[in-house]
Interface confidence: low
């Protein structure tokens, strides 16, 4: 586009500028070529030898112009039409440009400081002559020349009138810009444009509202000599929130999201999930639902699975082995990376199940405890004679630390059956002498319930270091056992089984074993000792 | 999920008109420049209109070889887009895709199914 | 209108290999160049837009070059799934032209 710094025909007043000697140029009014009043200068001192008719015009600030073009309409008179001034008469008129800070006022053009520089010479392309007077046939001619580069503020023109006779209809004086203008999503500003010999101008744009470039790498455009932007360079994105609308970034509305300014568009939010806000970058998931840390915000929320289905076990007594299988949960929360985990407790054999107890490190779980992707378990090392609750929980992604011990679990209670459920530690040193042990443990079936009083216990007992099979064997009905004719100072082990008479004896095993070394001869007295 | 629909292709006889529509979904319709492209054997892919904003006064722009026979048109309030076709030939045959512009970047991320249209006797 | 002139019109390759899809625009359109590919029976799909950005979900071995004029597009070690046709379109100016196409085929 063209920015103008002067137009001649847009002034209705009284141009005003400066005319030097008076009898040279002369301000007049008339109309352009479509009768609208203008206001022109004249001069046409023809017959009259050595004319130097000078007129200059106002200060013209020159913008943010450097290249300035300057266009000027003019008639001139054919001086072969005019009688007798065939010696006198030019057909020629100079124009000049002079640069200033500031307004020089009316005085004389060749004044103020720096010499005007000559622009160039004018001439007609079409002269008019007497006959084209008559008939109102004024040619108008048009020029246009360059100026610049420009350096001070502003300027005056000035016309040099040498002897011709010569109508100025118009003086239009502009400069040529790129507009400014969004592109990429990037604003450009208005961009003065270099003359058309240089080397296009090269605008960094700045990225609109909410929005954002290649980092140190700001879109980019060309101001042409004709004031059109040329070869764009990069783009800007809308920021996360943010899509683009045309020529600007608007915000993802409710309901919408954009994580990164890599995607163009908003993206609705993903299943039981919401955004409730303008610009939202994610979408928050519903009450009980989740994402997992490693779930995209892309992904549909989701939620912890229900409990497995149809737990079932079978329980082998010999070795004591319980085996575990169940179905998927009904409802896996959505999610695919369902896994599960399971718990066991051992439980009185009676009474509440509260009265449960974690089974400790000694059980073993085949092929894992937590994070089975089988539907399947295996338990090992289980006492006989024992109550255990085994837990089986359902588990995905988002599944919270405490969900194994939360509701979505099926569980089963199974009973071991008689046996010798004891731990180690569970059997008690009464007494240590030379030539004795004395030793009891808990009743594996409590006094008074069914069962209690059929129960026996075998006690096998050998040197140890020496081979199992040299063992002796001692049975009693209680819970207690001395055992005598042992050699002093010797280290023995002991193993307990307990079993209902009948054929489930032969199926219980020794379990577990103990060490206890006796006292030597020196010793005087008896020892009581605690449980190990 | 972004999707377009188009609907009303089939076959219609030389000089006769035909209406095409396109139902859009899981985006703001109102704000995005929407566009019919068309895909023969004979030509391939071809541009055929656009349609811009309610802020650009819903300003339609045309390719040469439909001006003044085809009308595009849009119903924001029924995320939907139209193609009034008249005067049809036998070169406008081909599958007429919906599909829309980021802003004024005039790159075609998202297309319809397409909807055949055969211009016959 | 700006012709857009694509090269080869057909290509056949085996998986694993690079093959490259050159076109020409008939003026100077810059960097306003995008990459479509077509399955049979299916719509045009965006790969590429402003000459080399993928669009989300692209494989990286897609790569877009050029400026002005000449633009190619390069797939390396071609996958069985990149079978298709290919179209290059300006988006400088209304209205945006595409190419006529590339079938790249199985060997």
């Known amino acids: 586009e063209e920015v103008i710094l002067l137009d001649s025909k847009a002034s209705q007043a009284e141009l005003g500028w400066t005319a030097l000697p008076s009898n040279g140029w002369e301000e007049i009014s008339g109309v352009d070529e479509h009768d609208r009043p203008i206001r022109t200068y004249q001069v046409c001192n023809v017959l009259e030898p050595n004319q130097d008719n000078w007129l200059q015009t106002g200060w013209i600030s020159r913008g943010r112009g450097q290249r300035i073009f300057v266009e000027l309409q003019f008639t001139l008179r054919d001086c072969s039409s005019i009688p007798g001034a065939a010696g006198t008469c030019k057909e020629t008129f100079n124009v000049y440009y002079l640069e200033t800070e500031a307004d020089l006022g009316r005085g004389r053009p060749r004044l103020g400081g720096s010499r005007p520089r000559k622009i160039d010479t004018i001439a007609a392309d079409e002269s008019f002559t007497q006959g084209d007077l008559g008939e109102r046939k004024m040619k108008l001619n048009t020029e246009v020349r360059e100026i610049g580069p420009l350096s001070r503020r502003g300027f005056h023109l000035a016309f040099q009138d040498v002897g011709a006779c010569v109508a100025l209809v118009s003086v239009r004086v502009y400069y040529k810009q790129c507009r400014a203008t969004v592109r990429g999503l990037a604003t450009f500003p208005a961009t003065a444009a270099e003359s058309a010999f240089s080397t296009l101008v090269e605008v960094a744009g700045t990225c609109v509202a909410h929005s954002e470039g290649e980092p140190g790498s700001p879109p980019r455009m060309h101001c042409g000599a004709d004031g059109e932007w040329l070869v764009p360079v990069g783009r800007c994105s809308c920021s996360a929130g943010f899509q683009e609308r045309g020529d600007f970034c608007e915000a993802c509305p409710p309901g919408f999201y954009k994580v990164s300014p890599r995607r163009p568009l908003c993206s609705p939010c993903p299943e039981h999930s919401r955004a409730l806000e303008n610009a939202s970058t994610f979408c928050v998931c519903q009450d009980s639902y989740a994402r997992s840390p490693t779930d995209p915000p892309s992904a549909s929320c989701t939620r912890p699975p229900s409990a497995p289905r149809d737990l079932q076990y079978s329980l082998s007594r010999s070795p004591l082995v319980l085996r575990l299988r169940w179905l998927p949960p009904a409802d896996s929360g959505g999610r695919s990376d369902v896994t599960y985990s399971l718990l066991c407790l051992r439980c009185g054999r009676e009474g509440p199940a509260g009265a449960c107890e974690p089974c400790g490190p000694r059980v073993a779980f085949l092929p894992r405890q937590a994070g089975l992707r089988e539907r399947a378990a295996t338990l090992l090392h289980l006492r006989p004679g024992a109550r255990y609750t085994v837990r089986v929980a359902a588990l995905n992604g988002v599944s919270g630390p405490a969900a194994a011990a939360g509701t979505t679990y099926a569980q089963v209670t199974v009973s071991t059956g008689p046996g010798a459920p004891w731990e180690e530690d569970e059997i008690r040193r009464d007494r240590v002498e030379p030539q004795s042990v004395s030793l009891s443990w808990r009743e594996p079936i409590p006094a008074g319930a069914p069962g209690a009083n059929d129960t026996e216990y075998e006690i096998r007992y050998y040197e140890k270091g020496q081979s199992e099979q040299t063992y002796s064997m001692v049975k009693t009905g209680a819970p207690t056992v001395t055992v005598t004719n042992l050699k002093p100072a010797t280290r023995y082990v002991f193993q307990i089984r307990a079993a209902s008479p009948g054929p489930s004896w032969e199926a219980q095993s020794f379990n577990p074993s103990i060490e206890v070394q006796t006292l030597g001869e020196a010793a005087s007295g008896s020892r009581d000792q605690s449980p190990a | 999920e972004v999707k377009l629909e188009e609907s009303g292709g089939g076959l219609v006889q030389p000089g006769g008109s035909m209406k095409l529509s396109c139902v859009a979904s899981g985006f703001t319709f109102s704000y995005y420049w929407m566009n019919w492209v068309r895909q023969s054997p004979e030509k391939g892919l071809e541009w055929v209109a656009e349609?811009?904003?309610?802020?650009?006064?819903?300003?339609?722009h045309y390719a040469e070889s439909v001006k003044g026979r085809f009308t595009i048109s849009r119903d924001d309030s029924k995320s939907s887009v139209y193609l009034q076709m008249n005067n049809l030939r036998a070169e406008d045959s081909g599958i007429y895709y919906c599909?829309?512009?980021?802003?004024?970047?005039?790159?075609?991320?998202?297309w319809g199914q397409g909807t055949l249209v055969t211009v016959s006797a | 209108d700006i012709q857009m002139t694509q090269s080869p019109a057909s290509l056949s390759a085996s998986v694993g290999e690079t093959v490259t899809i050159t076109c020409r625009a008939s003026e100077n359109i810059y960097s306003y160049l995008a990459w479509y590919q077509q399955k049979q029976g299916k719509s045009p799909q965006l790969l590429v837009y402003?000459?080399?950005t993928l669009t989300e979900g692209v494989p990286s071995r897609f790569s877009g070059s050029g400026s002005g004029t000449q633009f190619s597009l390069k797939i390396d070690s071609l996958q069985p799934e990149d079978f298709g046709s290919y179209y290059c379109q300006h988006h400088y100016v209304t209205p945006p032209t595409f190419g006529a196409g590339t079938k790249l085929e199985l060997k």
């Open positions: 599909t829309f512009y980021y802003g004024s970047s005039a790159w075609f991320a998202y």
């Open positions: 349609i811009r904003l309610k802020s650009n006064n819903y300003a339609t």
């Open positions: 402003n000459v080399k």
